[in-house]
Amino acid sequence: AGVFELQIHSFGPGPGGAPRSPYSARGPCRLFFRVCLKPGLSEEAAESPCALGAALSARGPVYTEQPEAPAPDLPLPNGLLQVPFRDAWPGTFSLIIETWREELGDQIGGPAWSLLARVTRRRRLAAGGPWAGDIQRAGAWELRFSYRARCELPAVGTACTRLCRPRSASRCGPGLRPCAPLEDECEAPPVCRAGCSLEHGFCEQPGECRCLEGWTGPLCMVPVSTSSCLGLRGPSSTTTGCLVPGPGPCDGNPCANGGSCSETPGSFECTCPRGFYGLRCEVSGVTCADGPCFNGGLCVGGADPDSAYICHCPPGFQGSNCEKRVDRCSLQPCRNGGLCLDLGHALRCRCRAGFAGPRCEHDLNDCAGRACANGGTCVEGGGAHRCSCALGFGGRDCRERADPCAARPCAHGGRCYAHFSGLVCACAPGYMGARCEFPVHPDGVSALPAAPPGLRPGDPQRYPHHHHHHHH
């Protein structure tokens, strides 16, 4: 576990002049930033959007845009952008920084947001290292920033996967946690306020109860976007009382241009129609040249370069910008209790014993509907079924012609003839038997069992060859 930290130093026109904003501001503005982290893109599967996490900065100071030229450097929000990560730090990652402008005019539906710049870079970074500085151009804009990844105790190391242990031989006792990296002792974790939610609360100082995003209340038991009166269970309900419903995050639909709003913990998400983009679907000037299709999506433009775009998304992604991972297993494509695995590039079904097929649709134990061709019969057993084929046929479904002479069954130069009931051997002079296996003595008496009555040596010997082909 740990935190990725991003510090924006400046954002303004790059060398070579002031960029002309594609959006005309009608009043005071302020900036904010969004950071998105993805693991280094693997060769096997496309990663889900911002799989390592994302964060929004606070809003920066209000400024008024001059139509002639923007300020040399636009005023920035205070503080770091922090993206906590729960698992190991991957080392190689994609860093996406978006600069957004919020117009504070008198628009209906609240402020208008527009995306000014977006930089995407793949980076290699070890956790615990110093701040790494960078300067990136996005069109005519220039963004200067620093970033680092740091582990949160007890995790240490370049990937935050090692746990710090005391150097002394004795391990930490009950109720104690491992030491800080350079200390040779154990420390007790802070005791949170009594009743603080184990699920939604945490503390860094004894006696406090800090809430995870989306939860509130003294003990972090109240969801932020509660839309109806909630009586809390437990001893605190009498003191907490009933939460008065505030406006839900989707009230009044903050999504512009026909976007649909869905609530998320403590916030909302807009699903934008074709041709629109942004946190509130407010950006309409985006074309394919802006690269709006994420996760390998292909941008298909309209008849002219300035017309609206659509994104053709790779399998496994959806949304107007291919920004949402499809939970294809939720459609329960695997039949007969099979386990669904979404590999990113394809679906796989792991079938229960006795079932097979891409979607576990074949019941191996079931002869019902199982067609064995050419007179074959279906035989169940051993957790599978098979076809027992009639003479002259083989293969999984008895559809293949089987040549009984292919194995050269007639000994001593006998000639083999296929027959509806099997095969017939025409023996060379001096031999007899169903497969010409017995030599004939000079006096015409066989040394082994005699030929069937009425059959002279050298006559064709008919041998009913019951050679069933069993295929699992």
Epitope: A46, A289, C299, H312, P314, P315
Partner: antibody, heavy 118, light 108 residues
Framework: QVQLQESGPGLVKPSETLSLTCTVS????????WSWIRQPPGKGLEWIAY???????NYNPSLKSRVTISLDTSKNQFSLQLSSVTAADAAVYYC????????????WGQGTMVTVSS | EIVLTQSPGTLSLSPGERATLSCRAS???????LAWYQQNPGQAPRLLIY???SRATGIPDRFSGSGSGTDFTLTISRLEPEDFAVYYC?????????FGGGTKVEIK
């Protein structure tokens, strides 16, 4: 590993319609986009069209008025039809699978040469 | 459409040498959606690089890709005999999908 096999006539008369079929060796036809690309003798590659089992298609604008791409999941096949062919359409035609991480092509058929002549 | 121009047209090198191939786009290739292919005579192309810098499965690490925006590079750090072939770049950020004209790497 999945394999792709193109099939169709190697000789087409001018003004007629070229029809090619690509057979996918496994049952993955519903998991990927599938595409046709061509290469005139001694020249470079030209993308023609792609299709997804959901019905999504996309065509190269330079050929769109003459091209139809279709897909048959039951046969694990997809097909290309190019109408009103001329000598300029003579090429090696490849079918290919679209990569799962973007619209590049990770599996290709061996290609089939199509000659246009009367 | 985005036009991709590859240079040089032909590159004459010896085995063991380093090859640097260039692909320049007429406009920005969004999200570094650029691929490289290798094609031997009489064979279909083979995907080498996608996303400008990610090697496809089974591709040796002597092949590497770099670049963003409009300028992209394929580097073969040490040429092996089987590397002498034609190389194509392809952008897949904006429809229509387009290929470069190719660079032939031949034995000097």
């Amino acid at each position: 590993q999945v394999q792709l096999q193109e099939s169709g006539p190697g000789l087409v008369k001018p003004s007629e319609t070229l029809s090619l079929t690509c057979t996918v060796s496994d049952n993955s036809i519903s998991n990927y986009y599938w595409s046709w690309i061509r290469q005139p003798p001694g020249k470079g590659l030209e993308w023609i069209a792609y299709i997804y089992y959901s019905g999504t298609t996309n065509y190269n604008p330079s050929l769109k008025s003459r091209v139809t791409i279709s897909l048959d999941t039951s046969k694990n096949q997809f097909s290309l039809q190019l109408s009103s062919v001329t000598a300029a359409d003579a090429a090696v035609y490849y079918c290919a699978r679209v990569f799962h991480w973007g619209f590049a092509f990770d599996i290709w058929g061996q290609g089939t040469m199509v000659t246009v002549s009367s | 459409e985005i036009v991709l121009t590859q240079s040089p047209g032909t590159l004459s090198l010896s085995p063991g040498e380093r090859a640097t191939l260039s692909c320049r786009a007429s406009q920005r290739v969004s999200n570094t959606y650029l691929a490289w292919y290798q094609q031997n005579p009489g064979q279909a192309p083979r995907l080498l690089i996608y996303g400008a810098s990610s090697r496809a499965t089974g591709i040796p690490d002597r092949f590497s890709g770099s670049g963003s925006g409009t300028d992209f590079t394929l580097t073969i750090s040490r040429l092996e005999p089987e590397d002498f072939a034609v190389y194509y770049c392809q952008q897949y950020g904006t429809s229509p999908l387009t290929f470069g004209g190719g660079t032939k790497v031949e034995i000097k």
